[in-house]
């Protein structure tokens, strides 16, 4: 398996752990959605990462002005989606680069769903009984 | 010990099995147990729900309902090592769309 | 409002030990992370030792081995046992609570004082 498929919880490095939650979040087209990391922060400085399935590799987060954002308090690290969309859907990860040893850690990962219809086709088609 | 990750979420239709593999290197005979987390819930410990079933520690929930919903996280521990946990995956109980009152082929409809 | 009191500090001998609590006035079910940070004269604020809704611990390098953090699952108390102090271990310790929607309360501090 390569390498970002595996984790442990290493005893080592002060920023070998970094917590994400929650691990699941399913809202409504337009919602507001928060996800969440705890690390040691004196230890490095935290990004966030998504990937659209299971299997990608994730990608550094391109945050949109005005809809996304990071806060960092502390320990506490916290993405925000306003007005959330289809294309938002997939897994956003949190990662730690630690400053003495320039390993890269990783939270477990928040899966977004996005709920609704996609178009009005769908809806159409959903509601359809032929003559 | 290292754990591979898992889905982060499962969708099952209701009645039907669901299956969650706990992916480890471990080569030695490793006990794998399996918990489950309330969404939303944070109490502590989780529900244990027992022992993973083959080498890879699969669990399977037959016969789906509702109530199954959760984060499912299996543990494995070598020895009298600490065990490492797994990321968690969330099953998603769906219903299955009501069938139409009209449900007949498309041959049908079409006469 | 969310309260966290914490309790324990004082004036130790090196290689002594300390036990610090903190309970917070919140339900159990809302607690993600409960925390011990500290902050010594002239450095910025610390993570000390963090625990987790699942039991997952995490520790400062400094501390390893000598710190152990734990929780009452039934209560909103989360301790933080110090052995083999250090004269470095000095500083004001605080509780810090992280709720599942990531609302994170603080208590007042706890002075620590480790010196001969």
């Known amino acids: 398996a390569r390498s970002e498929d595996r984790y442990r919880n290493p005893k080592g490095s002060a920023c070998s752990r970094i917590w994400q939650s929650p691990r699941f979040i399913a809202r409504k087209r337009g919602f507001t959605v928060k996800m969440h990391c705890y690390m040691n922060s004196a230890s490095g400085n935290v990004s966030w990462l998504w990937k659209q399935e299971m299997d990608e590799n994730p990608q550094q987060l391109k945050l949109e002005k005005g809809r996304m954002e990071e806060s960092q308090n502390e320990s506490l690290a916290t993405l925000t989606i306003q007005g959330i969309r289809f294309e938002d859907n997939g897994i956003y990860f949190c990662q730690q680069k630690c400053n003495n040893t320039s390993e890269v850690y990783q939270g477990c990962g928040t899966e977004l769903r996005v709920m609704g219809f996609s178009t009005l086709a769908q809806l159409k088609q959903r509601n359809t009984l032929k003559d | 010990l290292w754990m591979h990750k898992v889905p982060a979420s499962l969708m099952v239709s209701l009645g039907e099995d669901a299956h969650f593999q706990c992916p480890h290197n471990s080569s030695n005979n490793a006990n794998v147990t399996w918990w489950r987390v309330l969404h939303g819930n944070y109490t502590w410990p989780p529900e244990f729900l027992g022992p993973g079933e083959d080498p890879n520690g699969t669990l399977i929930i037959q016969n789906v309902n509702k109530s199954h919903g959760g984060i499912y996280v299996c543990r494995v521990q070598e020895g009298n090592e600490s065990y490492q946990q797994s990321c968690g995956t969330y099953l998603r109980v769906r219903q299955p769309p009501p069938r139409p009152f009209l449900d007949m082929g498309e041959g049908t409809k079409n006469r | 409002d969310v309260q966290l009191q914490e309790s324990g500090g004082g004036l130790m001998q090196p290689g002594g030990s300390l036990s610090l609590t903190c309970t917070a006035s919140i339900s159990s079910l809302s607690i993600w992370v409960r925390a011990w940070h500290r902050q010594a004269p002239g450095k910025q604020r610390e993570l000390v030792a963090a625990?987790?809704?699942?039991?997952?611990?995490m520790y400062a390098d400094s501390v390893k081995g000598r710190f152990t953090i734990s929780r009452d699952s039934a209560k909103t108390t989360v301790s933080l046992q110090m052995d083999s102090l250090k004269p470095e271990d000095t500083a004001v310790y605080y509780c810090?609570?992280?709720?599942?929607?990531?609302?994170?309360?603080w208590g007042q501090g706890t002075q620590v004082t480790v010196s001969s």
């Open positions: 810090n609570v992280v709720t599942p929607k990531g609302q994170q309360y």
């Open positions: 625990i987790n809704s699942d039991g997952q611990t």
